[in-house]
């Protein structure tokens, strides 16, 4: 069947051959069945990715915990619902813990280094540098607009958008989400964030949908820098010789 | 392939009003800012006039006044109108294609050029 | 208003790499945008070579590139070819008007 494909995940592989010839999806990497009604966890994508690659004023200070995801791709631990493992470890036996969204927030350690648990990322928040226009964009309908589009592309309920700011040429996008806010069937602001980003990149991860294009008033929005700042439930624990910025 | 396509260039008189016309294809016209760029005989490059994706215009400082650029999307055309001719509008009119949408003013995102039309101001 | 300053002529032999500056542009909330724009000939259409500071479009050869360092804008043309030779016109942006330089004759010798 041509139409056995995931809407929400390019990087999956499908078949017919379950039961009842119903069309399931396979992240790559993993081989974890994913549900393609909504947003793969960036733990599995992060994983496809990987596998891929050896294939072939107004504005928001973040706050002093906040950490950006300096270290960039590697090629996680997820467990059996596709999210995080508390502990992660490079094939040189290098490990470290992270957050929800899978950023390190520990300094590095070895396989006696202990997590104890995956802390939850509760506040993410995406600041963004658009290019130049010859009117600032109107403040209102900037935010309109991208609440729009984090509910109806990436499904993320309305309420876990928090805030737009916008100082030109900067606009910050606040999502908070409390473990006890989200419910079972609720986006994780981790997986939106990180969709949002690769959007933002011109690398969609939507199977045959056209790249992102973001348009206020008829004005292209266009991205030339994006930072993203976590904000995890506890503090990270950094030693006090990590005090460089991201 | 991109094509920009001018028209509406020619033998003008001093005073009259010109009205020059631009093509394009190849490309979604309605999402990038367009503009017209002239080349008087023997000088160099000059920023006329031009229009983003949502219609805010820019025009340059010999043509202020003077000068109105516009857009028909439907037809994927952009029309400069230049009054009150003068004999330093004679030159090479250039239509000029920006790689972005948001802006009239950025000449650094000019990535496709037309052929040109020649306007010569005499009387 | 701004003016835009690049050499008047520049030239080198054939596999040289040539560099030509250009700066005085307008910034944008402390960001500078330049474009380089080839004319072989007067009268004939400019060719982009560069925009938005390092983008080329894909049918201009790697040996072309551009780099933004504060607010001067060098083009690089890295192993220069006697089809490069040419008037290299820089463009930028003065408060809300695009604007571009006299223009940098290169001559290969």
């Known amino acids: 069947q041509s139409n056995c494909t995931c809407p929400t995940n390019k990087m999956t592989v499908c078949d017919t051959n379950g039961p009842g010839g119903v069309c399931q999806c396979r992240a790559m990497g993993s081989q974890v069945l994913v549900d393609c009604s909504t947003l793969t966890s960036k733990c599995l994508l992060l994983k496809a990715r990987m596998s891929a690659r050896k294939s072939g004023r107004s504005l928001v200070m973040p706050s002093e915990h906040a950490i950006l995801d300096n270290d960039g791709l590697y090629d996680p631990e997820c467990d059996d619902k596709g999210r995080f493992k508390a502990r992660q470890c490079n094939q040189t036996s290098v490990c470290w813990c992270v957050n929800s969204v899978g950023v390190r927030r520990t300094d590095k350690g070895d396989q006696s280094l202990r997590c104890d648990e995956v802390v939850r990322t509760h506040h993410i928040l995406i600041e963004l540098r658009h290019r130049p226009t010859d009117r600032a964009f109107n403040h209102s309908d900037l935010d309109s607009e991208l609440r729009r589009l984090f509910q109806e592309r990436y499904k993320l309920h309305p309420s876990f958008l928090s805030a737009v700011h916008y100082e030109e040429p900067t606009i910050q996008i606040e999502l908070r989400q409390n473990a006890s806010q989200k419910g079972l069937r609720d986006v994780d602001i981790a997986d939106a964030a990180y969709y949002f980003e690769r959007d933002i990149k011109g690398e969609s991860l939507f199977m045959g949908r056209r790249g992102l294009d973001v348009q206020v008033r008829g004005e292209p929005l266009h991205v030339e820098r994006t930072l993203i700042y976590y904000l995890d439930e506890k503090p990270p624990q950094f030693s006090m010789k990590r005090l460089t910025a991201g | 392939a991109v094509t920009l396509d001018e028209s509406g260039g020619g033998l003008q008189t001093p005073g009259g009003a010109l009205s020059l016309v631009c093509k394009g294809s190849?490309?979604?016209?309605?999402?990038?800012?367009m503009g017209w760029v002239r080349q008087a005989p023997g000088k160099g490059l000059e920023y006329v006039a031009a229009i983003s994706s949502g219609s805010s215009t820019g025009y340059g400082a010999a043509v202020k006044g003077r000068a109105t650029i516009s857009k028909d999307t439907g037809q994927s055309t952009v029309r400069l109108q230049l009054n009150n001719l003068r004999a330093e509008d004679t030159a090479t009119y250039y239509c000029?294609?920006?790689?972005?949408?948001?802006?009239?003013?950025?000449?650094?995102?000019?990535?496709?050029w037309g052929h040109g039309t020649e306007v010569i101001v005499s009387s | 208003a701004l003016a835009l300053t690049q050499p008047s002529s520049v030239s080198a032999n054939p596999g040289e790499t040539v560099e030509i500056t250009c700066s005085g542009g307008?910034?944008?909330?402390?960001?500078?945008?330049y474009g380089w724009y080839q004319q072989k000939a007067p009268g004939s259409a400019p060719v982009t070579v560069i925009?938005?500071?390092?983008k080329r479009p894909s049918n201009i050869p790697s040996r072309f590139s551009g780099s933004t360092s504060g607010s001067t804008n060098t083009l690089t043309i890295t192993g220069v070819q006697a089809d490069d030779e040419a008037v290299y016109y820089c463009g930028s942006y003065d408060s809300s008007a695009g604007i571009f330089g006299a223009g940098t004759t290169l001559t290969v010798l």
């Open positions: 190849g490309f979604t016209f309605s999402s990038y800012a």
């Open positions: 925009y938005d500071n390092t």
């Open positions: 307008g910034d944008y909330y402390g960001t500078y945008y």
């Open positions: 000029a294609k920006s790689g972005y949408g948001g802006s009239a003013s950025y000449v650094s995102d000019i990535d496709a």
